[in-house]
């Protein structure tokens, strides 16, 4: 899967929550960021994530689509210069400081399972998705398309009216 352009086709600032409405939050601890999945209090402010959308071409052996075989890939950045990364060895999702061009571990194939929810498939490990495990984000292997609707890999993006990210 190759990214067809070095610039995102669009960027979108949103808060990220699980399918059962827990918020994804980010906390700086001991000079590194931790990612949490938690219930927020009623008026507690949701953390925002900058989603950058890139077009990507299917590998030619995977698709008969030719120029039509495009997918969307996203990178997720909750704060400047930090991006979510897939650590495929540890089956974990981590926040790392990176410079552009970002490594492949920072890219996720965007899936819409429902009209109002998305899933993120690791570019570096097809069939492995960001999911929720023990109140943390983790990489979860999904065996077949029948399991793609499993709720622990579904996330909601809710719009925000702020146009900068901290």
């Amino acid at each position: 899967m190759s990214i067809t352009g070095i610039s995102p086709i669009t960027e979108y600032l949103a808060s990220l929550s699980t399918y059962n409405d827990q918020s994804i939050t980010f906390a700086l601890e001991d000079e590194s960021y931790e990612i949490y999945v938690e219930d927020l209090k009623k008026d507690e402010k949701k953390d925002k994530v900058l989603l950058s959308y890139y077009e990507s071409q299917h590998p030619s052996n995977e698709s008969g689509d030719g120029v039509d075989g495009k997918m969307l890939m996203v990178t997720l950045s909750p704060t400047k210069d930090f991006w979510l990364h897939a650590n495929n060895k540890e089956h974990s999702v981590e926040l790392h400081k990176s410079e552009k061009p970002l490594p492949d571990q920072a890219f996720f194939v965007l899936h819409n399972m429902h009209s109002n929810s998305v899933s993120f498939e690791s570019k570096t490990d097809p069939g492995v998705f960001i999911g929720v495990k023990d109140n943390h984000l983790a990489l979860i292997k999904v065996d077949s398309s029948e399991n793609l609707s499993t709720e622990n890999i579904l996330f909601k993006l809710s719009e925000t009216h702020h146009h900068h990210h901290h």
Partner: antibody
Framework: EVQLVETGGGLVQPGRSLKLSCVAS????????MYWIRQAPGMGLEWVSS????????YYLDSVKGRFTISRNNAENTVYLQMNSLRSEDTATYYC??????????????WGQGTLVTVSS | DIQMTQSPSVLSASVGDRVTLSCKAS??????LDWYQQKVGEAPKLLIY???NLQTGIPSRFSGSGSGTDYTLTISSLQPEDVATYFC????????FGQGTKVEIK
Amino acid sequence: EVQLVETGGGLVQPGRSLKLSCVASGFTFSNYWMYWIRQAPGMGLEWVSSINNDGGNTYYLDSVKGRFTISRNNAENTVYLQMNSLRSEDTATYYCAKGHYSYSSYSFGYWGQGTLVTVSS
Amino acid sequence: DIQMTQSPSVLSASVGDRVTLSCKASHNINKHLDWYQQKVGEAPKLLIYFTNNLQTGIPSRFSGSGSGTDYTLTISSLQPEDVATYFCFQYNSGWTFGQGTKVEIK
């Protein structure tokens, strides 16, 4: 080359049923959301229904909910629209469309030529 | 539900003119907006997606811009073959078309 060919349109009386089919070729059908969009004579476009890649999630325009059913057969590269209890206001050209991106419900990347449904007594 | 309102309904301009079509959403749609062109007797065709990305094969005289609730399609130099109806379309929340703008040559 991507192709979408709709069939099944025609003249039908109010209250009767009709089933539209759309046969797809030139792309990996099971990777794409599929859609039905309609256009009443001389009017604008109106989204009618959507179905995700594996057929597990379907969506409908409020005015057709409970009357229309979208489905797909990925083995046969075909998407269907079963239309029951048809009304005169359902008269339109019905277009089949495919998503612009694999796996994503964004944009209609390609459209068929449409099939005309006329509901009249 | 999100409503999409296009203006004007009909636009008449001369060949070579710069033409601007407007589309307004009832809520913020986060640039999740397309423009489709439909010529008489033909199926619609995707022109621009995600607000400002030109579909493969579409002439560069077409461009899109906007954010939040306000979006614009611009034809930098109107050509006779651009006579068509143009529809905006949002997919941020559900799927909704605008009512269309018909572009004619004076």
